[in-house]
């Protein structure tokens, strides 16, 4: 399975010696190391920090460390002049305030550099007007609203809860509907578990604590002033007015003691229907404004924010490859942290520094991998992504030619119940059998492999005794390579149960509480959860570098194909008489999934059978499974979206963190039935069904026997 | 009726220990967060320690943390300081305080139990 | 640490007067501030948390007000019950301090 080219150690004992020397005591020194001071992207901490990883990479035995460096907007608040929201009376006078930062956790009290809750790239204003609560502000919260109880938001400033989607599509949607101002909260519905204390006591959100965040709808763009190229020395950048994302109205995060003094004074109409309540003790009354008594009392935001052209490292670790030294395998995390990043990102960070010693102590045993392996501690991730897609852009030419795979590695855990794997469908089989051939950490399944737990606590909804995999969306530094470049993709971490707990990611997410603590008291004191996802993350780096063959089965990637295209046909189905009028048909999409289909299967019996000591058909075969994923990029990019450029999966249009299959077409069919020109309309489903019919036959035909 | 009764203090001499003591009624006293707070007489308040519910987590005044010990018992309903080093400036009033979780104010007191250091 | 200053530290009233003490964090707390009331010879009481709400039983006469790092408790026409001893005290972050207190004594 594995290869021992170039290497004095035996296959079998390859991947075991590597993983064999991951440690869980080393993850938690290194969490411990990472989260003691906070590392906000652009600062002087975070550049120490870069400077600290490249040193120890070296020390581990990487071939080569770098440093990249770009100058990229980022978004601080005015150090002198602070954010809040007010109410304020008939006569202007403030006559409560939210709090300007969050009390700190216990053994932090004097720690400098704390970033006060913000929504970053908020623009300045001191909007004031009526409040409307919008719910989770979806897209089809605001259809309930303006639709079907005949509320405007124009012109108001309205107050959301977090979760569900994705903070910065809120702002989108707010702004979309007239908006003035948006507030953004964190209910104790969503996080706040029943029966779990709040810190620093359990993993609970108090009432004090806030989820920091930006609010871009960046698509892909990576640094909002030069969209497509790198941020470098010699960078043209665009004015302020034109960059790529920015929102247009003030954003601000607040926690729920202050949503409860916001909310209690709603008036207006009745929340529509159980679904728009959480937790508080409050009406969840939709407004505009407050009730009778309080009705001339207004909310008034004061946002002073800057949006600032500030550098960035990444840190570049390198590996160099026995054999096929031009084909890379990445694998990558980011560094920046809202505050401490005792989750997001530091579990991960440091779940990828165990990574690279074991690599560094196999390397300094004599061992290389087969193709190199890269490694990438990402910087302002938090900041929509920058760091990474700023490298990627630097680098296109020479990924989207030796680019076998990306893996990414932020968060090891947002819970401690099992596995959460999402990833081009050519990894199930790699996934599949790597955590067959892993222990499981879960209790009550000593003694068993991780597949086995994943599967009966996560099963797939389509295939008995198989886990769930899931598709990949967007929120992460995988984006560029994925959606953009067409590189083959996957993540892995620890995750909650999604049954029982229906909260949105966990509780503490980019709050101040967020701490080394957090982790080691609550979610893995023993760090074997962690180390679960070193063996996940790493196994999979070391397949996919050293394999002769590449472990990709283009044969799952039919399998999804023909699920997507018969759900996206039923969506179409719903219209059955204008499908009809305009002569709508699906017969190519399912054609060319049909021929996929059959070539796959013709590509993966040559696979079993040809002679892989021939190093030009090994490298034939394993560039037709590499470019697989490539061959789904459409150059043009999806309508209005040119960096998400992957016809099969992209980012959905109404939640970033979600994946859309074949996101062309449903974007097109997407409340067709309110469009003003339905003939319009349907001809653009049209075009995009021609457009994936084509991209999933053209990708079919790369891998058929090549004369 | 939430009460909360200190054992008794007493003279003590300088360099020796005490082990105070309260016991709680009234209430569900592992859903509280727990303290000490003391008075030198005629004087104002100053907080000496918290323990959180279940007595996994303490906090203390710095300038007593390396001589001072809170812990608690849920199953007895009882809460305890142990002084140890005693000196002259530690003679005060020692009230026993409950408050609902770490940000959070004393909503119940004891009566207090008069601790005095000297030779 | 945060510091809490109290104003007055003492202050003579008559029964029905109204009188306000003044409470001020070296640092802002938002309204993680809570007030208490002490007799001679007794335990302190709770008055008012989170700087404005009233504790369960106590009078309206009583009001909290303030945030930031400047506070007030106001006391509407005193009555004999109430003169004694008044603190404030943050709970923010560790160590939660108390002010000086202010001594209210009967004109």
């Known amino acids: 399975k594995s290869s021992n080219e170039a290497t004095n150690i035996t296959p079998k004992h390859n991947m075991k010696a590597f993983l064999d020397e991951l440690k869980a005591e080393n993850i938690k020194k290194f969490l411990y190391n990472f989260t003691q001071i906070p590392h906000l992207a652009g600062t002087e901490q975070n550049f120490q920090l870069a400077k600290q990883i490249q040193s120890q990479w070296k020390e581990f035995g990487l071939d080569s460390v770098e440093l990249a460096h770009y100058d990229v907007l980022l978004s601080y608040p005015n150090k002198t002049h602070p954010n809040y929201i007010s109410i304020i009376n008939e006569d202007g006078n403030e006559i409560f305030n939210t709090s300007l930062f969050e009390p700190p956790p216990p053994g932090y009290e004097n720690v400098s550099d704390i970033v006060p809750p913000f929504s970053a790239f908020s623009p300045q204003g001191m909007p004031e007007g009526d409040l409307v609560y919008v719910n989770y502000a979806r897209t089809e919260d605001f259809f309930k609203l303006e639709r079907d109880m005949k509320i405007n938001c124009s012109g108001k400033i309205v107050i959301a809860r977090y979760g569900k989607v994705f903070r910065g599509n809120k702002v989108k949607n707010a702004q979309l509907a007239g908006a003035k101002g948006v507030i953004l909260y964190s209910d104790p519905a969503d996080y706040f578990a029943p029966g779990v204390k709040s810190y620093p006591d359990g993993w609970n959100l108090p009432g004090g604590g806030v989820q920091r965040g930006n609010i871009l709808n960046l698509n892909g763009a990576g640094d909002p002033l030069t969209p497509g190229y790198p941020a470098n020395e010699y960078a043209y950048r665009r004015g302020i007015a034109e960059a790529v994302g920015l929102p247009s109205i003030p954003v601000h995060p607040i926690g729920y003691y202050d949503a409860q003094k916001l909310l209690e004074k709603m008036g207006g109409s009745a929340p529509p229907d159980s679904s728009w309540r959480g937790s508080l003790k409050v009406p969840y009354n939709v407004g505009p404004g407050f009730t009778g008594n309080f009705s001339t009392q207004k909310v008034k935001m004061h946002i002073h924010s800057t949006n600032e052209v500030t550098r960035i490292y990444n840190v570049i670790g390198t590996l160099r490859g026995a054999v096929e030294p031009d084909r890379y395998v990445i694998l990558g995390g980011h560094r920046d942290s809202w505050v401490f990043g005792g989750i997001d990102p530091q579990s991960g960070a440091a779940v990828v520094h165990e990574i690279v010693r074991s690599f560094g102590t196999l390397k300094k045993e004599g061992w290389r991998p087969r193709r190199t392996i890269l490694f990438a501690s990402w910087d302002a991730e938090e900041f929509g992504l920058l760091g990474s897609t700023e490298w990627a852009e630097e680098n296109s030419r020479l990924l989207q030619e030796r680019g076998v795979a990306y893996i990414n590695a932020d968060s090891s855990i947002e819970g401690n119940y099992t596995l959460r794997v999402d990833c081009t469908p050519l990894m199930y089989s790699l996934v599949h059998n790597l955590t067959k051939e892993l222990k499981s950490p879960d209790e009550g399944f000593e003694g068993k492999s991780l597949y086995e737990s994943w599967t009966k606590k996560s099963p797939s909804p389509e295939f008995s005794g198989m886990p769930r995999i899931s598709k990949l969306g967007s929120g992460n530094d995988f984006e560029v390579f994925f959606q953009r470049l067409g590189i083959a993709s996957g993540r892995a971490r620890y995750t909650k149960n999604w049954e029982t707990n229906k909260f949105s990611g966990y509780p503490l997410y980019h709050s101040v509480y967020e701490t080394y603590e957090l982790v080691e008291k609550f979610y893995d004191p023993m760090f074997k959860y962690h180390l679960t996802v070193a063996q996940v993350r790493g196994g999979m780096v070391f397949e996919l570098a050293n394999s002769i063959v590449l472990p990709f089965d283009c044969r799952d990637y039919a399998v999804v194909l023909r699920k997507y295209a018969d759900k996206i046909y039923s969506i179409s189905m719903k219209h059955p008489q204008e499908m009809k009028t305009y002569s709508v048909s699906f017969d190519s999409l399912f054609s060319a999934v049909k021929n996929f289909t059959e070539i796959a299967s013709k590509f993966s019996e040559r696979l079993q059978d040809f002679d892989k000591s021939n190093p030009i058909v090994l490298r034939m075969m394993n560039d037709q499974l590499m470019f697989l994923e490539r061959a789904f990029i459409d150059p043009l990019g999806l309508p209005d979206r040119p960096f998400y450029r992957h016809v099969i999966y992209a980012p959905s249009s109404h939640n970033k963190y979600a994946g859309e299959s074949f996101p062309g077409i449903y974007d097109a069919l997407f409340d067709i039935e309110s469009k003003v020109d339905p003939s319009k309309a349907w001809g653009e489903v049209k075009r995009q069904i021609y457009v994936a019919a084509f991209t999933v036959q053209a990708a079919a035909e790369t891998l058929s026997e090549v004369a | 009726e939430v009460k909360l009764v200190e054992s008794e203090g007493g003279l003590v001499q300088p360099g020796s220990s005490k082990k105070l003591s309260c016991t709680a009624s009234?209430?569900?006293?592992?859903?509280?967060?727990m303290a000490w707070v003391r008075q030198v007489p005629e004087k104002g308040l100053e907080w000496v320690a918290s323990i959180n519910y279940d007595g996994s987590s303490t906090y203390y005044l710095d300038s007593l943390k390396s001589r001072f010990i809170i812990s608690r018992d849920n199953a007895k309903n009882n809460l305890y300081l142990q002084m140890n080093s005693l000196k002259s400036e530690d003679t005060a009033t020692y009230y026993c305080a409950g408050s609902d979780g770490y940000w959070a104010w004393f909503a119940y007191w004891g009566q207090g139990t008069l601790v005095t250091v000297s030779a | 640490d945060i510091q809490m200053t109290q104003s007055p530290a003492s202050l003579s009233a008559s029964v029905g007067e109204a009188v306000t003490i003044t409470c001020r964090a070296s640092g802002n707390i938002h309204n993680y501030l809570a007030w208490y009331q002490q007799k001679q010879g007794k335990s302190p009481q709770l008055l008012v948390y989170?700087?404005?709400t009233l504790a369960d039983g106590v009078p309206s006469r009583f009001s909290g007000s303030g945030s930031g790092t400047q506070f007030s408790l106001k006391i509407n026409s005193l009555r004999p019950e109430d003169f004694g001893s008044y603190y404030c005290?943050?709970?923010?972050?560790?160590?939660?301090?108390f002010g000086g207190g202010t001594k209210l004594e009967i004109k």
């Open positions: 009234g209430f569900t006293f592992s859903d509280y967060y």
């Open positions: 005290q943050h709970f923010w972050s560790t160590p939660p301090t």
């Open positions: 989170n700087a404005e």
